[in-house]
């Protein structure tokens, strides 16, 4: 029976470890600055890195600019978006800006898109200063189903800070759905 | 066999509980206001509480102003930094401020420092108002190896809000590395 | 013994699954805009949804405007608070605003309230712009005991954005207390 108990312990340890790893999808995606859209209106950001620098993904999929859920669960979602402008980049079309981020969920089964989180600020970036900067952070806990897609929309994408420490979003699974 | 099953269950419950607790390092460090550097340039903040008020640490180490990772894993890192100024504190040298935070990772094996997250804003804190306040929040999910160190850099440290609910940073382990 | 092992495995799987789900309380509460207080002073927000749209709760209780902890543990707490003003809403009493959030913990055993996290900004919302917006995000890792209550206080509640993606707070349990 001792040998049997050891076998049970061993198989259980394997199962626990394996199931724990399988049960915890995550992603941390950083902005791909080579393909940032221009304009000041709200646009969906489709170019993100998933496998270089701080960017990584496991048990989730990145496709067509969207983070796709492969496993039902409750996830913590977050986004950090930085905007900046230096006078050497040229004059702003307007000094009154609306700098916003929207974290949206799209369901393929029911083709609809819903905003999970939003954040931002209106700013007056006057010519009295040569440099302007502003960051937004949002985060929240959401139920996600396999096949659902997370995407990021921002206003004024041409003002985005292209650094990997500045503009990113991510998710990690916290628990199963009952 | 029933007794044996109970023994298996009991030992497993202990093992599961024990391994779960051991597998989840965390820290929440709050600013130690007795030792905030002066100056307006970017500086590393080295004085943090780890065992009073809301501050706490487990299975991580705080040493020389840095949060040291003792256990490989994927961690959620976060920081909340508040800046404030009241006219009774004196005159600002400039009303145009860059209020920033940088969460950095240092690896001892390869002596290099990299910024994981940044946030902040440029601000115009005019003399027309007697009080000014601004907070930054950043958060993200990162792979950390044992021995790596997390530290916080800010600009204008003399403007930091010294309250434990205002200026803090932390980490908690979410999952093992595959 | 094989049958016994299968039984052990089966019972363990049930136990592991059950204990895992039971061990992970969470809540994501969204603002109930039908009952937002007026005024510019700091007030406690007591009307939140817990079971519609993105709002949800499990193994925690929402009562009398407070999120009640039912299970000891270390929790990640977060809040996202959005303020907005459009000129069509009328003139602001003052253009100099202090837009703040305070996440507080109340213990019934020791009737006292303490601020866990705060964030916000002073803003100058001038009449030169027809629309103003600002969001705050805070988050942190805290030890919570059964019976303790989490509540949200804000300044200028009449400026709150009533959307579920804008103004919300939440918590999820990360680990047990040793």
């Amino acid at each position: 029976i001792r040998a049997e108990k050891a076998m049970v312990d061993g198989s259980w340890l394997d199962l626990a470890k394996r199931s724990k790893l399988e049960a915890q999808p995550f992603a941390h995606l950083t902005i791909n600055a080579t393909d940032i859209p221009s304009g000041s209106h709200k646009v969906s950001l489709s170019s993100w890195y998933h496998d270089r620098g701080w960017a990584k993904i496991s048990n989730m999929t990145f496709s067509n600019g969207k983070l796709i859920v492969n496993q039902d669960g409750f996830y913590y979602l977050y986004a950090n978006i930085c905007f900046r402008h230096h006078e050497t980049s040229g004059d702003l079309a307007t000094e009154y800006l609306q700098l916003m981020v929207y974290v949206t969920k799209t369901s393929i089964k029911i083709p609809s898109s819903h905003t999970l989180m939003k954040g931002g600020s209106t700013k007056y970036w006057s010519g009295n200063s040569e440099f302007h900067f502003y960051s937004i952070n949002v985060g929240g806990f959401f139920k996600l189903r396999s096949g659902e897609e997370i995407s990021i929309e921002v206003s004024n994408p041409s003002l985005l800070d292209p650094d990997q420490d500045a503009t990113y979003f991510g998710a990690f699974k916290v628990r199963d759905i009952d | 066999i029933r007794a044996e099953k109970a023994m298996v269950d009991g030992s497993w419950l202990d093992l599961a509980k024990r391994s779960k607790l051991e597998a989840q390092p965390f820290a929440h460090l709050t600013i130690n206001a007795t030792d905030i550097p002066s100056g307006s340039h970017k500086v590393s903040l080295s004085s943090w509480y780890h065992d009073r008020g809301w501050a706490k640490i487990s299975n991580m180490t705080f040493s020389n102003g840095k949060l040291i990772v003792n256990q490989d894993g994927f961690y959620y890192l976060y920081a909340n930094i508040c800046f404030r100024h009241h006219e009774t504190s004196g005159d600002l040298a400039t009303e145009y401020l860059q209020l920033m935070v940088y969460v950095t990772k240092t690896s001892i094996k390869i002596p290099s420092s990299h910024t994981l997250m940044k946030g902040g804003s440029t601000k115009y804190w005019s003399g027309n108002s007697e009080f000014h306040f601004y907070s930054i929040n950043v958060g993200g999910f990162f792979k950390l190896r044992s021995g790596e160190e997390i530290s916080i850099e800010v600009s204008n440290p003399s403007l930091l809000d010294p309250d434990q609910d205002a200026t803090y940073f932390g980490a908690f382990k979410v999952r093992d590395i595959d | 013994i094989r049958a016994e092992k299968a039984m052990v495995d089966g019972s363990w799987l049930d136990l592991a699954k059950r204990s895992k789900l039971e061990a992970q309380p969470f809540a994501h509460l969204t603002i109930n805009a039908t009952d937002i207080p007026s005024g510019s002073h700091k007030v406690s927000l007591s009307s939140w949804y817990h079971d519609r749209g993105w709002a949800k709760i499990s193994n925690m209780t929402f009562s009398n405007g407070k999120l009640i902890v039912n299970q000891d543990g270390f929790y990640y707490l977060y809040a996202n608070i959005c303020f907005r003003h459009h000129e069509t809403s009328g003139d602001l009493a003052t253009e100099y605003l202090q837009l703040m959030v305070y996440v507080t913990k109340t213990s019934i055993k020791i009737p006292s309230s303490h601020t866990l996290m705060k964030g916000g900004s002073t803003k100058y919302w001038s009449g030169n712009s027809e629309f103003h917006f600002y969001s705050i995000n805070v988050g942190g890792f805290f030890k919570l005991r059964s019976g303790e209550e989490i509540s949200i206080e804000v300044s200028n509640p009449s400026l709150l954005d009533p959307d579920q993606d804008a103004t919300y707070f939440g918590a999820f349990k990360v680990r047990d207390i040793d």
């Epitope: - | 600002l92 040298a93 400039t94 | -």
Partner: nanobody, 127 residues
Framework: EVQLVESGGGLVQPGGSLRLSCAAS????????MGWFRQAPGKGREFVGF????????YYADSVKGRFTISRDNAQNPVYLQMNSLRPEDTAVYYC????????????????????WGQGTLVTVSS
């Protein structure tokens, strides 16, 4: 890295005027408070004047008060030192520097309170 470049120096007769400028380049947020200093041949570095980031407040050494004026463009760069009624004792290399503190301290006239020094520009007052 921040770089400061002073210009506008030269030879001028006593009673004459010169306008020095200090331009910042590199990774800078040039709305910082700035100071002007000078170093005469064989002497230590001497405080000349100080201007806040907004330009709203200026301080001067007693030796130049009423003759020198520090200003800055509304749109940040550069910072100017207008020198009138120049005297032979004003002969020196003039430097600009970035004030390192967030608050104006009583020690604003000490060179240790500044960093990112420029290379300097020589002003010679002689007939």
């Amino acid at each position: 890295e921040v770089q400061l470049v002073e210009s506008g120096g030269g030879l001028v007769q006593p009673g004459g005027s010169l306008r020095l400028s200090c331009a910042a380049s590199g990774r800078t947020f040039s709305r910082s408070a700035m100071g002007w200093f000078r170093q005469a041949p064989g002497k230590g570095r001497e405080f000349v004047g100080f201007i806040t980031g907004s330009g709203g407040t200026t301080y001067y050494a007693d030796s130049v008060k009423g003759r020198f004026t520090i200003s800055r463009d509304n749109a940040q760069n550069p910072v100017y030192l207008q020198m009138n009624s120049l005297r032979p004792e004003d002969t020196a290399v003039y430097y600009c520097a970035v004030y390192r503190r967030t608050y104006i301290s009583s020690t604003y006239s000490e060179s240790s309170e500044y960093d990112y020094w420029g290379q300097g520009t020589l002003v010679t007052v002689s007939s």
